[in-house]
């Protein structure tokens, strides 16, 4: 009788499998920044090192009694979820505990920073195999805590953080809001978001994926073989830390970008009921529940992409939104989305040597999101070709003119504020293969890439009748790299990618006004990587 | 993800001359002060002074020492609780909030963040 959470995240074919690094030893080390832990618990004894690190605030209240089993409860449970002999995700993994939370589960940003620095020092003094840092804690947004996570991540450490239990936007909390950490929300046995009293799991664009976090069986500090169930995004993060430890145990050279992309790609999709989240957060929150991915040897050189949403631009006339990929990822396309439909489009530009996706609000708009499609493309060479807006009535064409470069995405940015004078941009695969086509007043940006064996094609789907959205999916074996909405309705909200699905959103009023002849078209650019083939555009 | 969401950033506009010291007057505060948007989670009196990324080891210590010296001139005792070298240049200090204006004008300071609570999730 295996606990539900392990059954959920570890597919049947993995259940009995031992993860070992190529040389036979499991060298992954997980650092847990939490409460003190009961190292003698049978679930974790012999595999946990309780460091002498202790940086916690005093407990509140004069009548507070320090009871060892209560002080150790949170950390012991998480240590058990990560590497417990029976109820652990990564059963053989060695764990180091740092005490940054007191007996009431409270810590400080400064204590957490000193803990992260302790890990960095340990790494410098005695370099070891892959390191995973589990941060099952959250405070208000902290620029310095996020910066420290970024610095540590850039040394090759993989950080996994709880999204937070505040039933709120995870971007308002740290370290959950740090882009370099893998941020985990919590789901229950029915794959639904976890409710915790009046609160529950955090959500939003800062969450990377969800994992089991309700009624999780794990080591109890009440006795050395006791178990108990606990709930929260800490438990969810511990599952993902365990999965990451297992992935690194098999393949110690996997990078943070590869780990994140694989976690996303192999997660269970579309099982979460998004209605639990506030309406404005539903589109931003990933509908993904973590599972242990197969090794890269079993899955070959797939093209892996994820969608990264920017922060909301805000409503000012010239407000811009910026979405960034991780340093190792390629920005293959950029689109934009506005709930009011008042946006002036999107484009890709280089900032500090990195390509970023930008979107611009329009006059009277409530703000926009920039939506980046970030992909792992080995040995890629990508560039942006843009053409300024054409004169009235003329089309603007941009294609990839370099040899062996293929079109992975199109962006369009309108110079004019007046939404009524412009038509939406167009992208037509039949007439102009591999071209971005913009109508009057639109600057057009083509994202062009060369990589061994990269091939792409356009897939379109149009709906003439009333519809809030039009979708088009890339077929199996192909990965969505670009997503645009083509002319039809007088007002579209924009386009974005959800996994391998391109979603074009239409304004309600536009639906009502539209004549049947004006189809709204979702245009997807689908690519695949076939290392043996040459880069090509598929007709 | 890293844009400052619900976060308080204050530019402390303070007299540049303070006590007429030439080196202080020369350095106009461009650094910002930040604190948690949730008041109950703040820890006033403890601050993380974050220095520019390229700040050298010796300069970190000098900046902390300079803050102590200048605070002492004003009759304040401050305590440097920790110096950060390995992840980012900076230091943790226990001091009166009266000294924030002074601290923000120190060379190499990028921003100062008030300490705050984190919680088990």
């Amino acid at each position: 009788s295996i606990p539900w959470n392990l059954e959920r995240i570890i597919p049947a074919w993995h259940q009995t499998e031992e993860d070992r690094s190529p040389d036979g030893s499991s060298q992954v080390e997980v650092y847990l920044l939490d409460t003190s832990i009961q190292g003698a618990h049978r679930e974790i004894e012999g595999r946990v090192t309780i460091t002498d690190f202790n940086s916690v605030p005093e407990e509140d209240g004069t009548r507070f009694h320090r009871q060892a089993s209560k002080c150790d409860s949170h950390g012991t449970h998480l240590a058990g979820v990560v590497s417990g002999r029976d109820a652990g995700v990564a059963k053989g993994t060695s764990l180091h505990s740092l005490r940054v939370l007191n007996c009431q589960g409270k810590g400080t940003v400064s204590g957490t920073l000193i803990g992260l620095e302790f890990i960095r020092k340990s790494q410098l003094i005695q370099p070891s195999g892959p390191l995973v840092v589990l941060l099952p804690l959250a405070g208000g947004y902290s620029r310095i805590l996020n910066a420290a996570c970024r610095h540590l991540a850039r040394t090759g450490v993989v950080l996994v953080a709880a999204a937070g239990n505040f039933r709120d936007d995870a971007c308002l909390y740290s370290p959950a809001s740090a882009p370099e950490v893998i941020t985990v929300g919590a789901t229950n046995a029915q794959d639904q978001p976890v409710t915790l009293g009046t609160l529950g799991t955090n959500f939003g664009r800062c969450v990377d994926l969800f994992a089991p976090g309700k009624d999780i069986i794990g080591a109890s500090s009440d006795c050395s073989t006791c178990f108990m169930s606990q709930s929260g995004t800490s438990q969810a993060a511990a599952h993902v830390a365990g999965i990451v430890a297992r992935m690194l145990s098999r393949e110690p050279t996997l990078t943070l970008a590869e780990l994140r992309q694989r976690l996303i790609h192999f997660s269970t999709k579309d099982v979460i009921n998004m209605a639990w989240f506030p309406e404005d957060q539903q589109v931003l929150t990933p509908n993904l529940v973590a599972t242990l991915p197969p090794s890269t040897h079993e899955t070959g050189g797939q093209l892996l992409c994820r969608t990264v949403w920017s922060a909301h631009s805000g409503p000012t006339r010239t407000a811009t939104a910026t979405a960034r990929c991780a340093p190792e990822e390629e920005l293959l396309s950029c689109s934009s989305f506005s709930r009011s439909g008042r946006r002036r489009g999107d484009w890709i530009e280089a900032i500090g040597g990195q390509q970023v996706c930008k979107a611009l609000n329009a006059f009277g708009g409530e703000g926009v999101y920039a939506v980046a499609r970030c992909c792992l493309v080995p040995r890629a060479n990508c560039s942006i070709h843009n053409t300024p807006a054409a004169r009235a009535g003329l089309e603007t064409h941009v294609h990839c003119h370099q040899k062996d470069h293929v079109l992975t995405g199109c962006s369009f940015h309108w110079e004019v504020e007046d939404l009524s004078v412009r038509r939406q941009p167009a992208l037509r695969s039949r007439r102009q293969p591999g071209q971005c086509v913009g109508h009057q007043a639109a600057s057009v940006y083509a994202s062009c890439c060369h990589a061994p064996g990269l091939e792409c094609k356009i897939k379109e789907h149009g709906i003439s009748g009333p519809s809030e959205q039009v979708t088009v999916a890339c077929e199996a074996g192909w990965t969505l790299t670009g997503c645009n909405v083509l002319p039809g309705a007088s007002l579209t909200l924009g386009a974005y990618s959800v996994d391998n699905l391109c979603v074009a959103r239409v304004h309600d009023t536009a639906r009502a006004d539209r004549t049947s002849g004006e189809a709204t078209v979702a245009a997807a650019i689908c690519c695949r990587s076939r290392p043996s083939a040459k880069a090509s555009w598929v007709q | 993800q890293d844009e400052d969401g619900d976060y308080e950033e204050l530019m402390l506009a303070l007299p540049s001359q303070e006590d007429g010291l030439a080196d202080e007057a020369a350095h106009v505060a461009t650094a910002t002060f930040r604190r948690c948007s949730k008041e109950a989670w703040r820890l006033p009196g403890t601050y993380i002074v974050v220095l520019m990324e390229e700040t050298q080891r010796l300069q970190i210590e000098q900046t902390a020492h300079r803050l102590q010296t200048r605070a002492a001139r004003r009759g304040y005792v401050i305590k440097v609780l920790h110096i950060f070298y390995d992840l980012f240049p900076g230091f943790l200090v226990k001091m009166s909030s009266d000294l924030l204006g002074l601290a923000l004008k120190l060379p190499h300071v990028e921003y100062i963040e008030e300490d705050s609570f984190v919680f088990a999730q």
Epitope: R42, E43, G84, I217, D222, C223, S224, F227 | -
Partner: antibody, heavy 118, light 108 residues
């Protein structure tokens, strides 16, 4: 080899008390904890409590809290079970057993019979 | 408090037959369950620890399996000396040591 030898059993009046002893030999006494377990005639095993000889820390089954007291004398490699206010239902064979907390009871004494009767 | 339920209460078998005793825990206990044998007039003896490991000197015909909440003690071929009472046991927080009610294996 490891040996545990109980003594002190016999006939006790209702309301009376008794002290059972368990002498250990064949290993380092303070390295293991000890449990006292009893078995009423024809019934199953019932755990009373344990002691860690190293620290002297004890833990009891709530049913025996205040009725049983476990102690030890490290110099004599002996542990004790003091039982007060005995009643007829306390009639049982009392065993001491060696353990590591969270592990099995790997060695048992032969048991000593306590009969509570007037 | 964890409750251990053993079944059957009595098992009537002949020598050479296979005996299977189950123990169900009311809560998850991982693999931290032990089995004991007690013959009339003797102290219990540890047979299996941590669900599946044979204690020192225990013959190979005794085996344990299971984890979580469901456990099994199997005697592959009963010898005359195996007719006895068998108990399962776990650790918990309150009380720390919990025994099952016992299963009597008797000669048919």
């Amino acid at each position: 080899q490891v040996q545990l030898l109980e003594s002190g059993g016999g006939l006790v009046q209702p309301g009376g008390s008794l002290r059972l002893s368990c002498k250990a030999s064949g290993y380092t006494f303070s390295s293991y904890s000890f449990s006292w377990v009893r078995q009423a005639p024809g019934k199953g095993l019932e755990w009373i409590g344990y002691i860690d000889p190293g620290s002297g820390g004890t833990k009891y089954n709530q049913k025996f809290q205040g009725k049983a007291t476990i102690s030890r004398d490290n110099s004599k490699n002996t542990l004790y079970l003091q039982m007060n206010s005995l009643r007829a239902e306390d009639t049982a064979v009392y065993y001491c057993a060696r353990q590591r907390v969270g592990y099995s009871l790997d060695y048992w004494g032969q048991g000593t019979l306590v009969t509570v009767s007037s | 408090e964890i409750v251990l339920t053993q079944s059957p209460a009595t098992l009537s078998l002949s020598p050479g037959e296979r005996a299977t005793i189950t123990c169900r825990a009311s809560q998850y206990v991982g693999s931290y369950l032990n089995w004991y044998q007690q013959k009339p007039g003797q102290a219990p003896r540890l047979l299996i620890y941590d669900a599946s490991n044979r204690a020192t000197g225990i013959p190979a015909r005794f085996s344990g399996s299971g984890s979580g909440t469901d456990f099994t003690l199997t005697i592959s071929s009963l010898e005359p000396e195996d007719f006895a009472v068998y108990y399962c046991q776990v650790w918990d927080s309150s009380p720390p040591v919990v025994f099952g009610g016992g299963t009597k294996v008797e000669i048919k």
